[in-house]
């Protein structure tokens, strides 16, 4: 906190310029008009102030705008954005994507800070949904952004925004998140032909139900093992050996290396050993010949 002192004669700032770096903190406080600072914030971003001097400038803006900064100031905060607390940011109303980009640029290369998380939250809530342009911007700066959202938050993503999602954006998503995103992706890509559709939908398949996997198995998609291992176990279990063979195509040989891992392990336990033997991979652990398999879930449904 800088104590209030009168501005020395001849030092009153007429504009925000380089000469201000020669002002002491108390002189900045006394000689720079807050309203002038607010209208010339863009100039602050070209002047090599010290961090201490920037603290004084922030203090002046805080006094001028106790209810929160207007967007005209926010857009030009530059480094000062990093000095804001989440509480400061919650007072803002940021509606312009350009403002969002400008502030994300300041934090570029760093982890998502509490300030950035609060800013994004305010921005998305202000827009009402996570539209394509916003999602494009956010995933460009933070590839893991989408997977940081709760399933409830993801439900506000319109299917049209799914076109902006890259495979790496989904790397850290868990099954609950993919359960929400998969139906949106299916809707977004529904007009694409078989092979193009599979390329686009592939990263979302961790949320796919059994019937969709069965349908894909009829389309010669040659799913790789990495994708197969990310499928929901409950979606894989009902697939027949023939369906898995068609789904994986030439990659079916990879099942041997994964036979002790989910979902392959659990799937093997559900298959007849006879059927597994047809693959010629030496997969073991299937239901021995002559055993009767009772589907208890079906029995419960009937009773």
């Amino acid at each position: 906190e800088v104590e209030k002192t009168a501005c020395p004669s001849g030092k009153k700032a007429r504009e925000i310029d380089e000469s201000l770096i020669f002002y002491k903190k108390w002189e900045l406080e006394a000689c720079v008009d807050a309203a002038l600072l607010a209208t010339q914030m863009d100039r602050v971003n070209a002047i090599p102030f010290t961090y201490e001097q920037l603290d004084v400038l922030k203090h002046k803006l805080d006094e001028l705008y106790p209810q929160g900064y207007p967007e005209s100031v926010i857009q030009h905060l530059g480094y000062l954005f990093l000095k804001m607390s989440p509480e400061d940011i919650r007072k803002w109303n940021v509606t312009s994507l350009e403002t969002l980009k400008a502030l994300l640029e300041v934090n570029k290369g760093h982890e998502m800070s509490p300030q950035v998380a609060t800013l994004i939250d305010r921005f998305v809530k202000g827009r009402g949904q996570l539209d394509k342009d916003t999602l494009d911007t956010l995933t460009a700066f933070y590839p893991g952004y989408l997977c940081s959202l709760s399933p409830e938050e993801l439900s506000s993503v319109p299917p049209s925004s799914i076109w902006a999602v890259r495979p790496q954006d989904l790397d850290t998503c868990d099954p609950r998140q993919l359960d929400v995103l998969y139906p949106k992706a299916r809707l977004a890509f529904q007009n694409m032909n078989g092979s193009e559709y599979f390329v686009k939908i592939q990263s979302f398949l961790g949320g796919a139900p059994t019937e969709d996997l069965k349908a894909l198995s009829q389309q010669n998609v040659s799913m790789d093992l990495a994708t197969f291992m990310k499928l929901r176990t409950d979606a894989v279990l009902p697939l027949t050996v023939a369906e898995v063979q068609k789904l994986l195509g030439p990659h079916v040989e990879g099942l041997k290396a994964e036979e002790r891992h989910r979902p392959v392990r659990d799937w093997i336990l559900r298959q007849r050993q006879d059927d597994l033997d047809t693959l010629g991979l030496g997969l073991q652990g299937g239901i021995p010949n002559g055993y009767l398999v009772l589907d208890l879930s079906m029995q419960e449904a009937l009773s």
């Epitope: 380089e18 602050v44 971003n45 070209a46 002047i47 090599p48 102030f49 010290t50 961090y51 920037l54 030009h76 905060l77 530059g78 480094y79 000062l80 954005f81 400008a102 640029e105 300041v106 570029k108």
Partner: nanobody
Framework: LQLVESGGGLVQPGGSLRLSCAAS????????IGWVRQAPGKEREGVSS????????NYADSVKGRFTVSRDNAKHTVYLQMNSLKPEDTAVYYC??????????MGQGTSVTVS
């Protein structure tokens, strides 16, 4: 973002020193740079500044005519040439930078003693 100052030392009154400011982990070329100093027990004060192109320079009244700020973007370095040094120039000298989107950087300082 970190800046690194060097070139400080002990010098007699009337002597000269040249301080350098370089970037660690990024390039200085599009950064405007300011030199500031802090004498023991005193507040930091601005000494000089130079624009990113090098076309514009500014000096505090106390160093005008004695100090010259320059930059060599090929070497990604900014210099502060200090001539006719006085005991009152004794301080830790820091460089502070501002780049695109208002990104900021500052160094740890280099000590200058005139005695």
């Amino acid at each position: 973002l970190q800046l690194v100052e060097s070139g400080g030392g002990l010098v007699q009154p009337g002597g000269s020193l040249r301080l350098s400011c370089a970037a660690s982990g990024f390039t200085l070329d599009n950064y405007a740079i300011g030199w500031v100093r802090q004498a023991p027990g005193k507040e930091r004060e601005g000494v000089s500044s130079i624009s990113s192109s090098g076309g514009s320079t500014n000096y505090a009244d106390s160093v005008k005519g004695r100090f010259t700020v320059s930059r060599d973007n090929a070497k990604h370095t900014v210099y502060l040439q200090m001539n006719s040094l006085k005991p009152e120039d004794t301080a830790v000298y820091y460089c502070a930078g501002v780049g695109d989107y208002g990104r900021r950087a500052m160094g740890q300082g280099t000590s200058v003693t005139v005695s």
